[in-house]
């Protein structure tokens, strides 16, 4: 056959759907690869063709659109399953073509099973709520296009395994779930089950997301350098190892880049000839505040090194701070036989 622009297997769009539930999958060509939409393509005489490769098979085969009750169908640029079966898992290809043009892309579809508490291998989206904020809402995701606006579905919300009713600060409001003055105990997996009728049948859509309660921007502060500080002096003799920790606390800030770095005599350690190593560790609080520690290490410090300026720097979206470490050379203890004896007039 003639040449076709093959975009390959689009693994960025690893689509997961639940077994025995409706699924509508849009051909990724129009969303991510081509500069025109399906309507334009269709009116230009292009045809959209679907086929698939079953899991653990190499053979591409056409999709059977003649199954009982139209279990699999195509509508414009959407492939419909009403509902899915476990063995629908595989790589699906949509191809747009006419006599002079051809473009296609494949994508993996995984049909997954869930247990009675909605646990499954499904990758869950994470929704962050700010601690103690007044009202915050999550919305049952990815249910658009499954039923017309004239159909009024029933929506049931669950936290973990438990139906949400009479929860003190979590209130189901149709497609939305409202959190009043969120606490860390609101962390968890929340599931909406949307039930709707279609052609005398009842379908269920299950959508689970993870809620993570994080620090509020209202409480956010610029980075706080706990170490080095004015109370600790790093007193070393030449030849000893110099270890200086830089420990910085960062308030949680959505999409903020937290940075910690050392300068030695105003330069980055990479830009100087000293044999210095820096090791970093990061820990997080329950509200995702962050503590970063960078330990500056000089294995065998010289008297020149002990005269240098060692400054810890930190930056977040809230501001930039810096703190110098107090480094000095240890004065050697006097040797009695020489220094002290001389002091007493001994010869």
């Amino acid at each position: 056959s003639e040449r076709c622009d093959d975009w390959g297997l689009d693994t960025m769009r690893q689509i997961q759907v639940f077994e025995d539930e409706p699924a509508r999958i849009k051909c990724p060509l129009f969303e991510h690869f081509l500069k025109f939409n399906y309507s334009t393509a269709h009116s230009a005489g292009l045809t959209l063709i679907w086929y698939w490769t079953r899991q653990d098979r190499d053979l591409e085969e056409p999709i059977n659109f003649r199954l009982p009750e139209n279990r699999i169908s195509k509508e414009k640029d959407v492939l419909w399953f009403r509902p899915t079966l476990l063995n629908d898992t595989g790589n699906y290809t949509c191809m747009l073509r006419n006599t002079t043009y051809c473009s296609k892309v494949a994508f993996p579809l995984e049909v997954v099973q869930k247990d009675s508490c909605f646990n499954s291998p499904m990758k869950l989206p994470v929704h962050k709520l700010y601690i103690e904020y007044g009202i915050q809402r999550i919305t049952c995701p990815n249910v658009d296009g499954y039923f017309p606006s004239s159909v009024k579905p029933t929506i049931t919300w669950y936290m973990g395994c438990y139906k949400i009713q009479n929860f003190n600060n979590v209130i189901p409001e149709g497609m939305n779930l409202s959190f009043l003055i969120a606490l860390i105990s609101n962390n968890g997996n929340y599931t909406c089950v949307v039930t709707y009728p279609e052609n005398g049948r009842t379908f269920h859509l299950t959508r689970t997301l993870t809620v993570k309660v994080v620090g509020s921007p209202k409480n956010a502060v610029p980075p706080v350098i706990h170490s080095p500080n004015d109370h600790v002096v790093y007193e070393k003799e030449p030849g000893e190892e110099l270890l200086i920790p830089c420990t910085v606390y960062f308030s949680f800030l959505m999409d903020s880049r937290n940075e910690v770095w050392w300068t030695i005599d105003g330069k980055k350690p990479d830009d100087i000839t000293i044999d210095v190593t820096i090791n970093e560790s990061i820990s997080h609080s329950r509200t995702e505040d962050e503590t970063r520690t960078q330990i500056l290490s000089i294995k065998k410090v010289t008297s020149e090194d002990l005269k240098r300026s060692y400054v810890c720097h930190a930056r977040s979206a809230k501001g930039e701070v810096a703190k110098a470490a107090k480094v000095k050379q240890k004065v050697p203890a006097p040797r009695y036989t020489v220094e002290l004896a001389c002091g007493f007039g001994a010869t």
């Epitope: 009202i135 009043l180 003055i181 105990s185």
Partner: antibody
Framework: EVQLLESGGGLVQPGGSLRLSCAAS????????MSWVRQAPGKGLEWVSA????????LYADSVKGRFTISRDNSKNTLYLQMNSLRAEDTAVYYC???????????WGQGTLVTVSS | EIVMTQSPATLSVSPGERATLSCRAS??????LAWYQQKPGQAPRLLIY???TRATGIPARFSGSGSGTEFTLTISSLQSEDFAVYYC?????????FGQGTKVEIK
């Protein structure tokens, strides 16, 4: 110095209404959640209601839900509790308290006595 | 709601002695537990939050421990001003709930 000063308590008949106020000073009022906690004579402490720093989120104990309304005016640094359909069992000293998730109720007012009796 | 149970209801201790107060939650509250002291005619005062962190200005003789469902407030050497009622309170879940209180009285 953080100060919370309640007012508005008094004697009211069953079924009556009362509005408590709590004037706050010594901290940025609009940064903190606030609560009302009550204590019936000779009894323990009972959380009544909470309001978020922005006034949008409000929570109530089941015993007062539908009868009490918590609100705040951040421009006046004042917290309110509107109490309707009062019952004899609402008789208590009502305290306002500042809260943070990390530190619970860290500051309390001195309380105002509400007596519901015919 | 989470039920907080304190024991004993009353604790009789001599000044200078150690006092140990217990608080149990009906389900885990992690370390989101506070202790308050209340003297007659006064408002409660925060002593301990986060199960073990002393609030500002609280003497070192007060210490808290525990996590999950079992918590303890210890007063290492009772002073005359420590005789009062002590309440534990969970702030893990709404509604925030208090224990019924332990009265520490002079023996």
């Amino acid at each position: 110095e953080v100060q919370l000063l309640e007012s508005g308590g008094g004697l009211v008949q069953p079924g009556g209404s009362l509005r408590l106020s709590c004037a706050a000073s010594g901290f940025i009022f609009s940064h903190y959640g606030m609560s009302w906690v009550r204590q019936a004579p000779g009894k323990g402490l009972e959380w009544v209601s909470a309001i978020s720093y922005d006034g949008e989120g409000t929570l109530y104990a089941d015993s007062v839900k539908g009868r009490f309304t918590i609100s705040r005016d951040n421009s006046k640094n004042t917290l309110y509790l509107q109490m309707n359909s009062l019952r004899a069992e609402d008789t208590a000293v009502y305290y306002c308290a500042r809260f943070r998730y990390y530190t619970a109720f860290d500051y309390w007012g001195q309380g105002t006595l509400v007596t519901v009796s015919s | 709601e989470i039920v907080m149970t304190q024991s004993p209801a009353t604790l009789s201790v001599s000044p200078g002695e150690r006092a140990t107060l217990s608080c149990r939650a009906s389900q885990s509250v992690s370390s989101n537990l506070a202790w308050y002291q209340q003297k007659p005619g006064q408002a409660p005062r925060l002593l301990i939050y986060g199960a073990s962190t002393r609030a500002t200005g609280i003497p070192a003789r007060f210490s808290g421990s525990g996590s999950g469902t079992e918590f303890t407030l210890t007063i290492s050497s009772l002073q005359s001003e420590d005789f009062a009622v002590y309440y534990c309170q969970q702030y893990n879940n709404w509604p925030w709930t208090f224990g019924q209180g332990t009265k520490v009285e002079i023996k």
